[in-house]
Structure formats: structure tokens, C-alpha cells
């Protein structure tokens, strides 16, 4: 049974995809794999906390570490990558603070800006001095494994050398890797002796090899590609958001909820009413009523801006976030002063009714 | 590990109701959805409805509003699917399921016959 | 209510072959859209999510591709162990309509 009565039947209109869904990102933690990771749970006043990653119980083990408000892992795997939160279980209420950990190597075989001057690997022979292919940065492909984060960009590199200079191709798992391989294809950039993937998915996980060959010879190297997956997850909305805030009568005032979501995330800006004089109906439940939310004719849902207020709009604004895995929802206060005195931005505090989490 | 346990299976008359039980475990069961989808013999999947735990909102398909009700017990970490005016067209296997329908439940059958 | 048009209904194929499943949807869903598999008297079992990703222990074999409306299931060489019902699923709004599952069988 629903811990709220609406005021009004709202029927809601069916919602138009967004083209994406990501907003606001929680804190992001990066590690290599075999690295310690220590993550303090940024939470006040909390009698107990409790630990989560992908919404199932985090205990210790021999590699996790639960110390007051820290968290420990030590020896980090990909397998570690996740999304974490923290409960701070207080005696009125509880709070969560999420975070990701991204346990990743490099994400390419070289720097990124090793694209703009590409001139070292690009070595000009003396046309006289026949050679087969060889490395000229062997640094540059020391690091043959590469667990990535699914959406991020992968670049391989094989600088090389020879005389006539060699030409490079690439194979997935031992067969020619053409573009229509993989959605969004990829790019070979010959000056810097790369292949570059952007966005990657799952589906790209495999064993990619440089074949670098001229007249005289042919050598190779293979990198495996690792993508971390995570497995889908509710809403996570930004802390601190809706804030507080005051204006004076006639005014106007902006509520903001920033959220991230995998998936069609469905807003809601809910208020609590008063009916026939009363905030709670017969069951003792609270009155709510629905603002706005997204849809169709509903332009920026994280925004709800409320114009010419009056001492009757003072209250509870809670934005609700849900999508099929779940829901998240954080609220603020709007404080309506008389018009002689001077509106002020309130501390940032998020104030969450018995209900919401 | 996560785990959906449901009751087992049911006969019913038409005209009346069933209840069918879903015991979530391994998991913060209030911080998913819980899932109710059906599916007749030899046909396919069909979404009947959802609730999320934690505040009891739940949410149903259209051909169910007003014959299906989802309910949650938090303190048990149980979901329940309550459907009505039972007809022989109802005999199927329900399934629950979490809210990012990667674990669901073994399934109750639930046979409409006079 | 968004529908999801799945096709073929059945195919048969042999084991190695590369399977390739349609699902069509009558609304722009962006990605989200899952893909599971059923074996007689079991549960569905999720294999992909958000249209691409590979859910935690699915082997590699299964993958998915699409965006928008159309979108693509694939086993790139079909095992004996794969024998089922695939069917697509759209998570995007209420109610999360599925396809109307495919048949596979081994020739």
C-alpha cells in the first residue's frame, strides 16, 4: 500500500525517450587492478553504517575492509567495479551517499597526447637501408591487458619502423576486424600507428593484434580488451539537490534535481497539500500532489520553477526519480518571507519525508 | 546470494481470487522494484505490474489495473500479486522478479478450472 | 503502450551457425531494451540489458546491437546449450512490454 494519497487522479502521459539519460555522475573512485582502495563515507552524524555494492550487502572478507567510515579493498580486481553506497542510519532517519569504483587499467596504450605530435613514431629510414618492421616504442605496448569501463575509448598502438615503410592491420581475435564488426566502427590513424574505439561495449572484449608487415618482413603484437561491465542500477540523484530555498511573496524560486539513471528515468515533483483543512488523509497517509513530471509536454523535468509565489506555496517539494530498476527521491523546503524582508539562499540541506529513503 | 522464493502452486475456481507470495533474500530488497509477470501455456511474457518496497508505489499494466494488486511486507521481505475475478484465461505461471529483472522467482502455477 | 514487434516467431539453425533476432519497436526507446532467454519449464534469464550490454556470466557469444527502434540479438556461433526461446523486452515506460519470443531449434 502506498505510503501517500494523492490529492488529484494524475493521469500521466506516456513518456518520450530521452535521446540520454545521464545528467549528473555520482564521485567516480579509479584504481589499477592490484592497487588498495580506501573510500571514507561522506555522511555526518551516523550512528551506524551500512555498505552496499550493486544494492547487495557489503561485509568483510579477506580483500574488504569495513572500519567505521571507511572502506577498504585491498588488491583491487575488475570484478571490484561497481556501484557503492554508504547508510548512515541515524535514530530519526537514514541518508546515502553513492559513489562508483572503476577498477581499470590505463585506458590506452599510450597518452592521448602522444596524437598530437605522432612525428617520434614515425620513422624515416635511409632509402638505401632495406629493413623488415620493428618496434620503435616498445614502452608503448608493455601493457597488454586492458580492462576498460564499458562507454569508455580504447587506443591500441604499435609504433613502428622498416624500410619500405610497413604498412598496419588490425585482427580481432585472429580474423580480419573490419568496421562493420562493431557498431560505430573504429579508426586507424597509420601516422600514429593506432586503432582507436570509441564507446565501448561488452561485445568488443577480445584479443586485437597489429600487423605491421613490409617486403621484408612481418611482425605482430596482441592486446586483450577487457570491458567492465555493471550491472544496471535506480536512479542515483545528486546530493545536496533540491536545495533549500526562500523568496518573498511575488517572487520566484528554481528547484533543481539532477539525476543519473541507466535507464528512461520518469520525474516527479511532488508537494503536501492540505485537503478539507487536513495534510494526512483517513489512513493517517500524507496528501501529495504531482507538479510536474516528464513526459511529452513537459519541458526540463529536473527544473521546477514556481513564479509569483504566495505564503500557500511554502512547504515540502520532493522530486522523485524511478525507472524500471527502482526509485531514488530527495526533497528541500521553500520558505516564503513577507515582502519587507530580504530573501536569502539557504545551507544546501536535503530533508526527506518519513517515507522516502 | 539472491534469491526469489514463491508459494507454490494453486487451483482455483472462476470468480475468485489467488495470492501468490515472492520471499526476496541476499539482496536490500527495498531498493528494487519487485516485478510480477505472467505467462499463459505455450504463450509468451507478459508484464502485469510493479511496486517498489520501500514507499508501496506500484504500477500496473492497463488490462490489470483494478483485477491485480501488488502489495510489499518490508519486514519480511515478501512481495505479493493478489488477482481477482479469476477466469480460465488467468491459468498461467506467474513470476516475480527484481527490479532489474536479472533474478526472478521459480514460478507459480496457478490453474483456473471449475 | 509501446509494442515490440519480434521476429522470425521460430528459426532452426546448426550448431556454429551465426542467429540473428529482430525486435522492432513502435516508439523511439532509446537503448533500453533487454533480451532474455527461456528454456521450457524454467525462468527467463537475462542476457543482455540497455541494448548492448552483456549481463555478469553470459558467455560472450550472445550480443546485442541497436538503438532508437531497431534492434538486433545475435548468438555469433549457435551451441547445443542454446536451444530455447529468446524474447526482447522494452524497459522504457510503463508497461515494459515483451516481444512475442522467438523459437530456436538446432537443425
Known amino acids: 500500500r502506498p505510503s501517500f494519497s494523492l490529492v488529484e487522479d494524475t493521469t500521466l502521459e506516456p513518456e518520450e525517450p530521452p535521446t540520454k539519460y545521464q545528467i549528473s555522475q555520482p564521485e567516480v573512485y579509479v584504481a589499477a587492478p592490484g592497487e588498495s582502495l580506501e573510500v571514507r563515507c561522506l555522511l555526518k552524524d551516523a550512528a551506524v553504517i551500512s555498505w552496499t555494492k550493486d544494492g547487495v550487502h557489503l561485509g568483510p572478507n579477506n580483500r574488504t575492509v569495513l572500519i567505521g567510515e571507511y572502506l577498504q579493498i585491498k588488491g583491487a580486481t575488475p570484478r571490484d567495479s561497481g556501484l557503492y553506497a554508504c547508510t548512515a542510519s541515524r535514530t530519526v532517519d537514514s541518508e546515502t551517499w553513492y559513489f562508483m569504483v572503476n577498477v581499470t587499467d590505463a585506458i590506452s596504450s599510450g597518452d592521448d597526447e602522444d596524437d598530437t605530435d605522432g612525428a617520434e613514431d614515425f620513422v624515416s629510414e635511409n632509402s638505401n637501408n632495406k629493413r623488415a618492421p620493428y618496434w620503435t616504442n616498445t614502452e608503448k605496448m608493455e601493457k597488454r591487458l586492458h580492462a576498460v569501463p564499458a562507454a569508455n575509448t580504447v587506443k591500441f598502438r604499435c609504433p613502428a619502423g622498416g624500410n619500405p615503410m610497413p604498412t598496419m592491420r588490425w585482427l580481432k581475435n585472429g580474423k580480419e576486424f573490419k568496421q562493420e564488426h562493431r557498431i560505430g566502427g573504429y579508426k586507424v590513424r597509420n601516422q600514429h600507428w593506432s586503432l582507436i574505439m570509441e564507446s565501448v561495449v561488452p561485445s568488443d572484449k577480445g584479443n586485437y593484434t597489429c600487423v605491421v608487415e613490409n617486403e621484408y618482413g612481418s611482425i605482430n603484437h596482441t592486446y586483450h580488451l577487457d570491458v567492465v561491465e555493471r550491472s544496471p542500477h535506480r536512479p542515483i540523484l545528486q546530493a545536496g539537490l533540491p536545495a533549500n530555498a526562500s523568496t518573498v511573496v511575488g517572487g520566484d524560486v528554481e528547484f533543481v534535481c539532477k539525476v543519473y539513471s541507466d535507464a528512461q528515468p520518469h520525474i516527479q515533483w511532488i508537494k503536501h497539500v492540505e485537503k478539507n483543512g487536513s495534510k494526512y488523509g483517513p489512513d493517517g497517509l500524507p496528501y501529495l500532489k504531482v507538479l510536474k513530471h516528464s513526459g511529452i509536454n513537459s519541458s526540463n523535468a529536473e527544473v521546477l520553477a514556481l513564479f509569483n509565489v504566495t505564503e500557500a506555496d511554502a512547504g515540502e517539494y520532493i522530486c522523485k526519480v524511478s525507472n524500471y530498476i527502482g526509485q531514488a527521491n530527495q526533497s528541500a523546503w521553500l520558505t516564503v518571507l513577507p515582502k519587507q524582508q530580504a530573501p536569502g539562499r539557504e545551507k544546501e540541506i536535503t530533508a526527506s519525508p518519513d517515507y522516502l529513503e | 546470494q539472491v534469491q526469489l522464493v514463491q508459494s507454490g502452486a494453486e487451483v482455483k475456481k472462476p470468480g475468485s481470487s489467488v495470492k501468490v507470495s515472492c520471499k526476496a533474500s541476499?539482496?536490500?530488497?527495498?531498493?528494487?522494484?519487485v516485478h510480477w509477470v505472467r505467462q499463459a501455456p505455450g504463450q509468451g511474457l507478459e508484464w502485469i505490474g510493479s511496486?517498489?518496497?520501500?514507499?508501496?508505489?506500484?504500477t500496473y499494466d492497463e488490462d490489470y489495473r483494478g483485477r491485480a494488486t501488488i502489495t510489499a511486507d518490508k519486514s519480511t521481505s515478501t512481495a505479493y500479486m493478489e488477482l481477482s475475478s479469476l477466469r480460465s484465461e488467468d491459468t498461467a505461471v506467474y513470476y516475480c522478479?527484481?527490479?532489474?529483472?536479472?533474478?526472478w522467482g521459480q514460478g507459480t502455477l496457478v490453474t483456473v478450472s471449475s | 503502450d509501446i509494442q515490440m514487434t519480434q521476429s522470425p516467431s521460430s528459426l532452426s539453425a546448426s550448431v556454429g551457425d551465426r542467429v540473428t533476432i529482430t525486435c522492432k519497436g513502435s516508439?523511439?526507446?532509446?537503448?533500453?531494451i533487454a533480451w532474455y532467454q527461456q528454456k521450457p519449464g524454467k525462468a527467463p534469464k537475462l542476457l543482455i540489458y540497455?541494448?548492448?550490454y552483456r549481463y555478469s556470466g553470459v558467455p560472450s557469444r550472445f550480443s546485442g546491437s541497436g538503438s532508437g527502434t531497431d534492434f538486433t540479438f545475435t548468438i555469433s556461433s549457435l551451441q547445443p546449450e542454446d536451444i530455447a526461446t529468446y524474447y526482447c523486452?522494452?524497459?522504457?515506460?510503463?508497461?515494459?512490454?515483451f516481444g512475442q519470443g522467438t523459437k530456436l531449434e538446432i537443425k
Open positions: 540497455s541494448a548492448s
Open positions: 522478479a527484481r527490479g532489474d529483472f536479472a533474478y
Open positions: 511496486i517498489y518496497p520501500d514507499n508501496g508505489d506500484s
Open positions: 541476499g539482496y536490500i530488497f527495498t531498493s528494487y522494484n
Open positions: 523486452q522494452q524497459h522504457s515506460t510503463t508497461p515494459y512490454t
Open positions: 516508439n523511439g526507446i532509446s537503448n533500453d
